[in-house]
Structure formats: structure tokens, C-alpha cells
């Protein structure tokens, strides 16, 4: 998977008046990494992992960047003409990626009241707008403002892209990100499904990086995809990930089934418990 840095900024307006603060979150490799503390007006690391990435360096650069981005987004919201009374939001999501072959990707997306209305692929300088008339109007509005604003030229977007990549590379220099390996906790549970059948579920949690193989085996052979149900690999809020796989088996055949897990070059197999619940920690 590529390494990525994702900025998520939101500004609000009330009855047509743009509010002074802004919300900002930054994700590194899909994990919550930074957020903007509105009380202290500072960028704050999200958890110990994020703190470790920069070590004892300050977060001044991140604070400055987020503050600048928030200011830009507030100005953009002020130029959206169709603001009705009540609360409205403008959200900008900016992502840059570095792939295994060292190629890069960069994109930018704008949402109004949670609805996507404008996207840009920075490399190709291609803007895309959803079909809806509301999105078309909003996009035209914002594009016109961005064109008017001398700052928002092609060079500006490429500079933003370059800054994003520069930051990403800086974070990746930290061995905490590149060499971080957290083995999963694996637990297997069983539940009655229907007469003569049980559902067995294998859960892997608290692992990093995101890539994992989790599959049910019968007699040591992987079950076919259509007999297994997989959960998404999702962040668990602690800078790590979680996922699951389930299948239905005949009662009395439990000993034939094992959950196979492979992560970061290590692997383990986990039997189906004979009782109701069994939690097994992987020890490598």
C-alpha cells in the first residue's frame, strides 16, 4: 500500500456569516495523526504513536500550515453565494501519496454540507464535478473565486502538492512509521447459527501496518472465498487496525477448522474453541 498524508479541514458558517474557527484532522497512512486544537490554536499529535513520529521536535510547522489552510478555506466559504440561513459547512480533503515505485499522486476534494461538489487531480490538473445541478453551481462559484484569487494558480496547487509530499517524506524518515510493526491479537469465537451449524468468527485487532491475511482453513486448506465473509480492515482508534473473517461450519467438525493469520512476515494458526469463547494472543 502507498504511504499517504490526508488533510481534512472543515469551516462553518451561520446565517451566511463565516465562523472564525475551523476543524482540522490529519491522517498518516490512514491513521489519525494530528488534529487542530481550537482552544490552544495549535496542531496536536493524536496519541503516543504520532508524538513518537516527530520525537522531541515541535509542531510549529504543522500549526502554521493548518492555520493557513483554515484561513484559505474560510475565504472560499465566504464566496459561496447560495448560503441560506442556518448552519453550513465547507470541507476540503487533500491527499498526497507515495507509492512503492516512488511515483506520487495528489488530489483535492471539496464538500458543501457533506456533499462532494468539486475534485481535482493535481498531477493532471483535471477538475471533476458531479452531475447534480447544485454541485455544478457550487463548483462554478468556487472555481471562479479560486481563479480570481491570485494565490490559487496552477503553481499554487503544485506547491501545495510539493509541501504535502515534503511533509510526508519528513514523517516517513521517522523509523517509527517505516519500521513500525504491531502484531495482531487474534481471537476465535463461535456462535450457534442454525440446527447443526455454528458460525465461527476470527478477529484480528491492534495490528500495524494495515496489510494482513486472515482466512479460514479446513484441514489446512483455505476455504473458497464464497464460503467466507470478511470485514473491512478498519482503524481501531489506537493507531492500529482491526478486521474479522467468519464462516459457517457443521457442529462436531470444529477440529478440522483453523483461522490462519499472516502479518508482516509472521503467521499463526488458531483453532476453533470447544466452548463458547476463547481468546488467543499471538506470541511471535
Amino acid at each position: 500500500e502507498p504511504h499517504s498524508l490526508r488533510y481534512n479541514l472543515t469551516v462553518l458558517s451561520w446565517d451566511g456569516s463565516v465562523q472564525s474557527g475551523f476543524l482540522a484532522e490529519v491522517h498518516l497512512d490512514g491513521q489519525p495523526f494530528l488534529r487542530y486544537d481550537r482552544q490552544k490554536c495549535r496542531a496536536k499529535p493524536q496519541g503516543q504513536w504520532a508524538e513518537d513520529v516527530l520525537g522531541n521536535k515541535t509542531w510549529d510547522r504543522e500549526t502554521r500550515d493548518l492555520t493557513g489552510n483554515g484561513k484559505d478555506l474560510r475565504m472560499t466559504l465566504a464566496h459561496i453565494k447560495d448560503q441560506k440561513e442556518g448552519l453550513h459547512s465547507l470541507q476540503e480533503i487533500r491527499v498526497c501519496e507515495i507509492h512503492e515505485d516512488n511515483s506520487t499522486r495528489s488530489s483535492q476534494h471539496f464538500y458543501y454540507d457533506g456533499e462532494l461538489f468539486l475534485s481535482q487531480n493535481v498531477e493532471t490538473e483535471e477538475w471533476t464535478v458531479p452531475q447534480s445541478s447544485r454541485a455544478q453551481t457550487l463548483a462554478m462559484n468556487v472555481r471562479n473565486f479560486l481563479k480570481e484569487d491570485a494565490m490559487k494558480t496552477k503553481t499554487h496547487y503544485h506547491a501545495m502538492h510539493a509541501d504535502c509530499l515534503q511533509e510526508l517524506r519528513r514523517y516517513l524518515e521517522s523509523s517509527v512509521v517505516l519500521r513500525r510493526r504491531v502484531p495482531p491479537m487474534v481471537n476465535v469465537t463461535r456462535s450457534e447459527a442454525s440446527e447443526g451449524n455454528i458460525t465461527v468468527t476470527c478477529r484480528a485487532s491492534s495490528f500495524y501496518p494495515r496489510n494482513i491475511t486472515l482466512t479460514w482453513r479446513q484441514d489446512g486448506v483455505s476455504l473458497s472465498h464464497d464460503t467466507q465473509q470478511w470485514g473491512d480492515v478498519l482503524p481501531d482508534g489506537n493507531g492500529t487496525y482491526q478486521t474479522w473473517v467468519a464462516t459457517r461450519i457443521c457442529q462436531g467438525e470444529e477440529q478440522r477448522f483453523t483461522c490462519y493469520m499472516e502479518h508482516s512476515g509472521n503467521h499463526s494458526t488458531h483453532p476453533v474453541p470447544s466452548g463458547k469463547v476463547l481468546v488467543l494472543q499471538s506470541h511471535w
Epitope: D219, G220, V221, S222, S224, R256, H267, S268, T269, P271
Partner: antibody
Framework: QVQLKQSGPELVKPGASVKVSCKAS????????IYWVKQSHGKSLEWIGY????????VQNQKFKGKATLTVDKSSSTAYMHLNSLTSEDSAVYYC???????????WGQGTLVTVSS | DIVLTQSPTTMAASPGEKITITCSAS???????LHWYQQKPGFSPKLLIY???NLASGVPARFSGSGSGTSYSLTIGTMEAEDVATYYC?????????FGSGTKLEIK
């Protein structure tokens, strides 16, 4: 490439026991099960049982329970089958096999001939 | 135990001939659990076809497999001298795993 190297032929007396070994190489030993199969002279194949080298869990053919004991030594990537109380009925070629995770007996050892004779 | 009955028990074929070996199960099995092996004289068995119709690595395309339920078959499109061997079907659907009694294929 995946290789399973079995121990050499054994000539044993009735009532004695024998331990057949199967050394795996070319893959991570604890990743895949080791299966054991018996082939009596000029006959078909009979499945004895299998062992999961990661945790030592076994599943056996009821017919061979009490006859065959399956174990592994992870440090040497070797699987063992101990056969006890041997009779002439146990004279056969014994094979170990492993899987690639998609089919049961994907790779086979060269076989170990066990002859039970007084 | 699931009994697998193979036929014929032995057969002789000329080079270039099409061969079909059948395997009949005493009870229905899913096609995911039926495999075929080839054993040449003096050698270990070798996986030929897995999950009814998938060719194992390095197996020539003249071999094919098909079937479902209780009836399965192995076909050699054009017999070659090197195909002289005993062929076994095997089920992994229920414990104990069982093998067919084998079909010995000779050359005319």
C-alpha cells in the same frame, strides 16, 4: 522449492515400534499442515492423519488412533510419525505430504518403506 | 466413510487415444473436495488435478477433470507414453479422507 525428505527404510520385528521422520525445506514449516499416508504393497492409499506444525494440533483417521502418533520439531522443521505394536499388516510405504494452502496433498516426500518381519 | 469407486481398474491405450477414468462416490461431495493424483511405478504420488477441474502446477493441458455430486472423471485428451501410471481420485469432504482404489493405465 518445497521439499520433503523422509528417513530411510526400516526393518523391524513384530511388536516393536518405529519412528519415521519427514524434514521439510523450501517454505515456512509452521505455515502448512503435514499429512501422513500409508500405501501397502500393490494397494491403494490410506490417509493416516495430519498435524498442524504451528500448534501441534492433530486430526486422525480413527483406524490409526492408537497405532500412529504424530509430532513435530519446529526447530528442525521435521515432522515425525511414531508407529507402535507393529504387525505384518503395518508393512507398507509411508508418505508425508504437505499443502500449498489450496489443495490437500500438493507436495509428497519420497516415502519410507517399513517392513515388519521376524 | 465415503467410498470412492474407480473404473476401469486397469486399461491399455494407444498413444494419441483419448482416455476417461471415472470416480464414483458413495455419497455426494462438493466439487471443491475432489482431487486426482498420478503415481508412476516406483515413485511417490503427484497431485494432478485439485478441486475437480484445476490443473496442478506443471501438469500438461491434455489432462482435465470434471464432475459434481457423486460422479467425477479424469480425462487425458491424447494419451502419451509418459502417462503410464496409476491414477487415484481422493475426497477431502469428510474425515477420514479416502482414496479410490486406483486405475492402472498402460500403453498398447
Amino acid at each position: 522449492q518445497v521439499q520433503l525428505k523422509q528417513s530411510g527404510p526400516e526393518l523391524v520385528k513384530p511388536g516393536a515400534s518405529v519412528k519415521v521422520s519427514c524434514k521439510a525445506s523450501g517454505y515456512a514449516f509452521t505455515k502448512y499442515n503435514i499429512y501422513w499416508v500409508k500405501q501397502s504393497h500393490g494397494k491403494s492409499l490410506e490417509w493416516i492423519g495430519y498435524i498442524d506444525p504451528y500448534n501441534g494440533g492433530t486430526v486422525q483417521n480413527q483406524k490409526f488412533k492408537g497405532k500412529a502418533t504424530l509430532t513435530v520439531d519446529k526447530s528442525s522443521s521435521t515432522a515425525y510419525m511414531h508407529l507402535n505394536s507393529l504387525t505384518s499388516e503395518d508393512s507398507a510405504v509411508y508418505y508425508c505430504a504437505t499443502t500449498d494452502g489450496y489443495s490437500l496433498f500438493t507436495y509428497w516426500g519420497q516415502g519410507t518403506l517399513v517392513t515388519v518381519s521376524s | 466413510d465415503i467410498v470412492l469407486t474407480q473404473s476401469p481398474t486397469t486399461m491399455a491405450a494407444s498413444p494419441g487415444e483419448k482416455i476417461t477414468i471415472t470416480c464414483s462416490a458413495s455419497s455426494s461431495i462438493s466439487s471443491n473436495y475432489l482431487h486426482w493424483y498420478q503415481q508412476k511405478p516406483g515413485f511417490s504420488p503427484k497431485l494432478l488435478i485439485y478441486r475437480t477441474s484445476n490443473l496442478a502446477s506443471g501438469v500438461p493441458a491434455r489432462f482435465s477433470g470434471s464432475g459434481s455430486g457423486t460422479s467425477y472423471s479424469l480425462t487425458i485428451g491424447t494419451m502419451e507414453a509418459e502417462d503410464v501410471a496409476t491414477y487415484y481420485c481422493q475426497q477431502g469432504s469428510s474425515i477420514p479422507f479416502t482414496f479410490g482404489s486406483g486405475t492402472k493405465l498402460e500403453i498398447k
